[in-house]
């Protein structure tokens, strides 16, 4: 369960994080599982442990194997396993599937390619980027922090992208490369001023005192991937989290749906055990993006009990 695959190339740096997390103050011990031999912490060793990180500087094919990390918390010793495979460098340009990180998709509006695992390393900009082994040149390509931005993405931009950077450890430099596939979604996206589908403006929602009630704020923002779009609820002009009523909560995370090709978001407001005072509040459904903000207001009213008398 707490196991993670890691891979790298011989003569490159490889840094692996323990699959078990912990507070920075927790001691982490590393072992080579096959021999149960402790991994040293002294940095003079080619392979050494540094807290939650296991460092191969540089890696060798013989380092392949399963490594055990034990995070010593105040209560339990929590165990994780890192399955490490170090491959020989390929002489040709092809990057085999087993060296590939997860595929990312982009479109004309959104074309960021993040360099995988880079956050584990001590590196300095700029990154070098390659596509199918060719160094990327031209004004369309911008290496920004830990990612590559491609302007005016075209279907021909799909392919395997490799980032290359230098890891520095105590003054010594080690090369690292990482490759992932990039696919282009063929979509003519656009964004427009938010359109709130629900609730209707100044809607009156009937609720029963003592029961639970759900209000859904649903809005569409355009077609395709939206750079910035959000829907949220406010109570009397205050964010739900700041309002401080634990019975009233926004659903964690925004549900994304594509209605007739449109990019839409919805956020559910859950009111537990509806009380009289909830009827006095103003409920605002807010939808915002780069074009601006739209607000629809809802009020609650008491649902009259059904009259069973004839």
């Amino acid at each position: 369960k707490f196991s993670k695959q890691s891979w790298g190339l011989e003569n490159e740096a490889l840094i692996v994080r323990c699959p078990r997390q912990g507070k920075p103050s927790y001691t982490v011990d590393w072992y080579y599982s096959q021999t149960n031999k402790s991994i040293p912490t002294q940095e003079r060793n080619r392979v050494f442990a540094s807290g939650q990180l296991l460092k191969f500087l540089p890696a060798a094919v013989a380092d392949s194997g399963i490594y055990t990390c034990i995070v010593r918390s105040p209560t339990f010793n929590r165990t994780g396993y890192a399955n490490v495979t170090i491959y020989k460098k390929q002489s040709d340009c092809n990057v085999p599937d087993y060296l590939m990180y997860s595929t990312v998709s982009g479109s004309e509006k959104n074309s960021k390619i993040y360099c995988p695992t880079i956050d584990l390393y001590n590196w300095t900009a700029p990154l070098e980027w390659f596509k199918n082994c060719q160094a990327l040149q031209g004004s369309r390509y911008r290496a920004h922090k830990s990612f590559l931005v491609i302007d005016n993405v075209m279907t021909e931009d799909a392919g395997d992208y490799t980032c290359k950077f230098i890891h520095n450890e105590n003054g010594a430099n080690y090369s690292v490369t990482a490759t992932r596939s990039f696919t282009v979604k063929d979509e003519q996206g656009f964004s427009l001023f938010p359109v709130i589908g629900a609730p209707a403006q100044n809607e009156i929602k009937e609720v029963e005192i003592g029961k639970n009630a759900n209000l859904t704020c649903s809005a569409c923002f355009g077609k395709g991937t939206q750079f910035l779009a959000a829907v949220l609820w406010q109570l009397n002009g205050t964010k739900i989290t700041d309002f401080g009523e634990p019975r009233i909560q926004q659903e964690e995370g925004q549900n994304q749906s594509f209605s007739n090709g449109l990019a839409c978001l919805d956020m559910v407001l859950r009111i537990a055990d509806v009380k009289e005072e909830d009827l006095l509040l103003q409920y605002d459904c807010l939808a915002l993006n780069l074009h601006g903000l739209r607000r629809h207001t809802v009020r609650l009213s008491r649902k009259n009990p059904i009259d069973h008398h004839s």
């Epitope: 369960k1 078990r20 997390q21 912990g22 507070k23 103050s25 995070v71 918390s73 105040p74 209560t75 339990f76 929590r78």
Partner: antibody, heavy 121, light 106 residues
Framework: QVQLVQSGAEVKKPGASVKVSCKAS????????LHWVRQAPGQGLEWMGT????????VYNQKFKARVTMTADKSTSTAYMELSSLRSEDTAVYYC??????????????WGQGTLVTVSS | EIVLTQSPATLSLSPGERATLSCSVS?????MHWYQQKPGQAPRLLIY???KLASGIPARFSGSGSGTDFTLTISSLEPEDFAVYYC?????????FGGGTKVEIK
């Protein structure tokens, strides 16, 4: 959503044992250690110990070590706390509780509703 | 075991006032957690890792401190804030709680 539902109130005689259950739902039971905390009437909170449901490993507060047994049934996602040789000072509300994110020990974010155990002759 | 001492034992304040609760530790700890408890209810996590606000907790609650002295502050008391507050350490076993501070209406 995460829920910890405990068994009902118990009345026991001194010297007897009590076994309180805590049924977990809304998350993967074996991914989180479960803790037991008690509170005597009008008193503060006291940590009794914890169990890792995946392995069955336990860590007990030394104060209770001789009398407490914590177990977990993976098939029903239920944890149990048994306290033996009961005495009147064991009268308390017993809570099961869980951290928000296990590996970071970031406080008890989820609590059972509590089980009142009364020890009286 | 690590002993946590909370002061004052009782704090009498009016709504709108600022509340400052202290937790003193017998030996240095890295983090402190804070809970609120109302009569007949289970405790509720307010602040974790000394200063981080737990989910759904209003911003008027804040935590600070390091080493052996930690503080919970309620910037402006609301009627629902009158309760008992506990600090708790997770630095070493056994995990321990402070004796509690009761915040009552003046």
């Amino acid at each position: 959503q995460v829920q910890l539902v405990q068994s009902g109130a118990e009345v026991k005689k001194p010297g007897a044992s009590v076994k309180v259950s805590c049924k977990a739902s809304g998350y993967t039971f074996t991914d989180y250690e479960l803790h037991w905390v008690r509170q005597a009437p009008g008193q503060g909170l006291e940590w009794m110990g914890t169990i890792d449901p995946e392995t069955g490993d336990t860590v007990y507060n030394q104060k209770f070590k001789a009398r407490v047994t914590m177990t977990a049934d993976k098939s029903t996602s239920t944890a149990y706390m048994e306290l033996s040789s009961l005495r009147s000072e064991d009268t308390a509300v017993y809570y099961c509780t869980r951290a928000f994110y296990n590996d970071y020990d970031d406080g008890f974010a989820y609590w059972g509703q509590g089980t009142l155990v009364t020890v009286s002759s | 075991e690590i002993v946590l001492t909370q002061s004052p034992a009782t704090l009498s304040l009016s709504p709108g006032e600022r509340a400052t609760l202290s937790c003193s530790v017998s030996s240095s700890v890295s983090y402190m957690h804070w809970y609120q408890q109302k009569p007949g209810q289970a405790p509720r996590l307010l602040i974790y890792d000394t200063s981080k606000l737990a989910s759904g907790i209003p911003a008027r609650f804040s935590g600070s401190g390091s080493g052996t002295d930690f503080t919970l502050t309620i910037s402006s008391l609301e009627p629902e804030d009158f309760a008992v507050y506990y600090c708790q350490q997770w630095n070493s076993s056994p995990l321990t709680f402070g004796g509690g501070t009761k915040v009552e209406i003046k």
